[in-house]
Interface confidence: medium
């Protein structure tokens, strides 16, 4: 079953290569187990950046080596992607699945264009 997912159109990563955005979903039921996946679309290819399952009211738990962190509040997920470089500029899509209890719902946002600008190297001081 389809579900509406909203996310910002554009986000600019900071000078340390960190970008944050909110992914909000319109929950049609009382989900207790939610799965959030961040997908990157570039050159018509879609790859999974990270994914986490969380119980409502609890923290998101990404894998230890994940570049993502996040927190949840109600039907909002605050996602942070770290370690980005200019080559990682692209469309980052938020996918939300209401895993339990049935019925299963899934929604995909329109994507957030994340722009990453590599910092200029500091000039050598004389």
């Amino acid at each position: 079953k389809a579900m509406h997912v909203a996310q910002p159109a554009v986000v600019l990563a900071n000078s340390r290569g960190t970008a944050s955005f909110v992914c909000e979903y319109a929950s049609p039921g009382k989900a207790t187990e939610v799965r959030v996946t961040v997908l990157r679309q570039a050159d018509s290819q879609v790859t999974e950046v990270c994914a986490a399952t969380y119980m409502m009211g609890n923290e998101l738990t990404f894998l230890d080596d994940s570049i993502c962190t996040g927190t949840s509040s109600g039907n909002q997920v605050n996602l942070t992607i770290q370690g980005l470089r200019a080559m990682d500029t692209g469309l980052y899509i938020c996918k939300v699945e209401l895993m339990y209890p049935p019925p299963y719902y899934m929604g995909i946002g329109n994507g957030t264009q994340i722009y990453v600008i590599d910092p200029e190297p500091c000039p050598d001081s004389d």
Epitope: T32, E33, M56, G57, N58, Y100, P101, P102
Partner: antibody, heavy 122, light 111 residues
């Protein structure tokens, strides 16, 4: 280790009520659904319903809606099922079981209590 | 509600041979991603024990002689080679939707 502890047996008079307990330990109680399953002597398994301790959300099979009431006490990590207006048809073993994370297990019950045998007799 | 029909109701298998138990659902319990069918073993006086989840995944600690397969409406539990300790009743269970339901059970005897 994960454990679900249930009393061994309960003897109840017809027409009375009984409240069965299921004490959880070894995991974060508020993160997992608890299911209740009925098994009459020599018969198969019947799903009664489930409850999520984190939010008190519950679901029931239609035929048990007027028979069973599921509750939890998060302070003691215990789940309860009250059965009312008992008849001989309610004589059975009642199991509580933990629902493994749906994302990983797809709705399987990975840990079970040993069950409480309820006998309805005058 | 989805009805699960298990067959046979009872089964006698010689030690070391293969036991095959079938579970048929009245409608599909599968999605494009998962097959929401699970298998349990129950011995007299004991609670059910999870053997197989999501149709074909072996639960931790369960011997590799147990295997599950199937999708849609037809699922199978295989035990091979059967050992004496496998004498028990086996149940399938769906989780595609609520209410959860169990199959009627298959009693496996070893000769």
């Amino acid at each position: 280790q994960v454990q679900l502890q249930q009393p061994g047996s309960e003897l109840v008079r017809p027409g009375a009520s009984v409240k069965l307990s299921c004490k959880a330990s070894g995991y974060t109680f508020t993160n997992y659904w608890v299911h209740w399953v009925k098994q009459r002597p020599g018969q198969g398994l019947e799903w009664i319903g489930n409850i999520f301790p984190g939010s008190d959300t519950s679901n029931y099979d239609e035929k048990f809606i007027s028979k069973a009431t599921l509750t939890v006490d998060t302070s003691s990590s215990a789940a309860y099922m009250q059965l009312n207006s008992l008849t001989s048809e309610d004589s059975a073993v009642y199991y509580c079981a933990r629902l493994a994370y749906f994302t990983n297990y797809g709705g399987a019950m990975d840990y079970w209590g040993r069950g409480t045998s309820v006998t309805v007799s005058s | 509600d989805i009805v699960l029909t298990q067959s046979p109701a009872s089964l006698v298998v010689s030690l070391g041979q293969r036991a095959t138990i079938s579970c048929r659902a009245s409608k599909s319990v599968s999605t494009s991603a998962y097959n929401y069918m699970h298998w349990y073993q129950q011995k007299p006086g004991q609670p059910p024990k999870l053997l197989i989840y999501l149709a074909s995944n072996l639960e931790s600690g369960v011997p590799a002689r147990f295997s599950g397969s199937g999708s849609g409406t037809d699922f199978t539990l295989n035990v091979h080679p059967v050992e004496e300790e496998d004498a028990a009743t086996y149940y399938c269970q769906l989780s595609r939707e609520l209410p959860y339901t169990f199959g009627g059970g298959t009693k496996l005897e070893i000769k």
